[in-house]
């Protein structure tokens, strides 16, 4: 699919039993933009790289055992975890007086599960109990899905108080304006 840069060639991670793998760091390779040149970035926001593969929505394979109480699957199941950014960070700086804050330069997309698959697994139980059969729902693919106004609201805290967005969550007024109208106003930040 469009933004799945590493659909089949991601290294398979086999963590210890019960461990959930950490997605790999987004930016390990020093190809980041210079912080000073770009006026810094809001906290918790990864810096850009020029290499799109560094922030593609990718499907990382990992394996885990399915447990149900004391019972555990005979074999581990392979699952996907959706990881990465969907394109460039969509934030632009806005300077007002001496303060600098951030506003969006595009809709916010997140790398999330797209399709799921059901898999039947056999659980082995201790103490001579009969094996149980269970159906588990596993992530089958990922996509870059747009977050709505509602989804974004909880994320404001990541960008500090200057990013507070009172408009979020308000009901749309029954009129439209062109993009030009937003230039003179305080803009929103994701």
């Amino acid at each position: 699919q469009g933004w799945q840069a590493f659909k089949n060639d991601a290294t398979e991670i086999i963590p210890e039993l019960g461990e959930y793998p950490e997605p790999p760091p987004e930016l390990e390779n020093n190809k980041t933009m210079n912080r000073a040149e770009n006026g810094g970035r809001p906290p918790h926001h990864p810096f850009e790289t020029k290499d799109v593969s560094e922030y593609s929505c990718r499907e990382l394979h990992f394996t885990r055992y399915v447990t149900d109480g004391p019972c555990r699957s005979a074999k581990p199941v392979t699952e996907l975890v959706c990881s990465g950014q969907c394109g460039p960070a969509r934030l632009l700086p806005n300077a007002i007086g001496r303060g600098k804050w951030w506003r969006p330069s595009g809709p916010d997309f997140r790398c999330i599960p797209d399709r799921y698959r059901a898999q039947r697994v056999q659980l082995l139980c201790p103490g001579g109990e009969a094996p149980r059969a269970r159906k588990v729902r596993l992530v089958a693919s990922c996509k870059c899905k747009r977050l709505t106004r509602f989804h974004n609201q909880s994320e404001l805290k990541d960008f500090g108080t200057e990013a507070a967005r009172p408009q979020k969550g308000r009901k749309p007024r029954p009129r439209a304006r062109s993009a030009k109208a937003n230039q003179a106003e305080l803009e929103n930040a994701y």
Partner: antibody, heavy 123, light 107 residues
Framework: EVQLVQSGAEVKKPGASVKVSCKAS????????MHWVRQAPGQGLEWMGE????????GYNQKFKGRVTMTTDTSTSTAYMELRSLRSDDTAVYYC????????????????WGQGTTVTVSS | DIQMTQITSSLSASLGDRVSISCRAS??????LNWYQQKPDGTFKLLIF???RLLSGVPSRFSGSGSGTDYSLTIYNLEQEDFATYFC?????????FGGGTKLEIK
């Protein structure tokens, strides 16, 4: 007046590269992401990717990954799209388009388009 | 990728008519649907965003509606300048995708 003016038509051989420019005027260039869309003869529109002029970060349609590079020159308010390893099916009109925003409805759209650059790939 | 289908590739109508152009998405796009007009010289103009919001300066004879996977653009009282090609575009999931276009011709 907000305008996007693109470079002239290009004729290229298969395997070559092309670099199309898009000069913006009438607005603050770094305030809007620039997107690139192409239209093959008699076909629909295909989104290629976007670039944030403020940071230089770009994101591309997976279809073009490895062949396309988008850049900007903020000193001249110009966006560039380079497509490498050209094939005959890359023959198309290439458009730059500004991503505009409506803060009332919290929505985004391509509100300003360039006039298009015809790229012909032929041996 | 989300497929956007404009079933009618061309449509003939007369001045003063009302026409509807449909657009179907391969999955729910949460009303993130925009409509563009392409003139014969290749120039593009945004008409409607978020399914039904008319861009400032666009004549009120243009109207958009729909939800889920089915959307439509209606033009009332067709004028000469409306004869062009119309494209829908979804903004719900990357990559952005467009319909194949519907060419509106004079009958």
């Amino acid at each position: 007046e907000v305008q996007l003016v693109q470079s002239g038509a290009e004729v290229k051989k298969p395997g070559a590269s092309v670099k199309v420019s898009c000069k913006a005027s009438g607005y603050t260039f770094t305030d809007y992401n620039m997107h690139w869309v192409r239209q093959a003869p008699g076909q629909g529109l295909e989104w290629m990717g976007e670039i944030n002029p403020n940071s230089g970060g770009a994101g591309y349609n997976q279809k073009f990954k490895g062949r396309v590079t988008m850049t900007t020159d903020t000193s001249t308010s110009t966006a560039y799209m380079e497509l490498r390893s050209l094939r005959s099916d890359d023959t198309a009109v290439y458009y730059c388009a500004r991503l505009g925003y409506d803060d009332i409805y919290d929505d985004w759209y391509f509100d300003v388009w360039g006039q298009g650059t015809t790229v012909t790939v032929s041996s | 990728d989300i497929q956007m289908t404009q079933i009618t590739s061309s449509l003939s109508a007369s001045l003063g008519d009302r026409v509807s152009i449909s657009c179907r998405a391969s999955q729910d796009i949460s009303n993130y649907l925009n409509w563009y007009q392409q003139k014969p010289d290749g120039t593009f103009k945004l008409l409607i965003f978020y399914t039904s919001r008319l861009l400032s300066g666009v004549p009120s004879r243009f109207s958009g509606s729909g939800s889920g996977t089915d959307y439509s653009l209606t033009i009332y009282n067709l004028e000469q300048e409306d004869f062009a090609t119309y494209f829908c575009q979804q903004g719900d999931t990357l990559p952005y995708t467009f319909g194949g276009g519907t060419k509106l011709e004079i009958k």
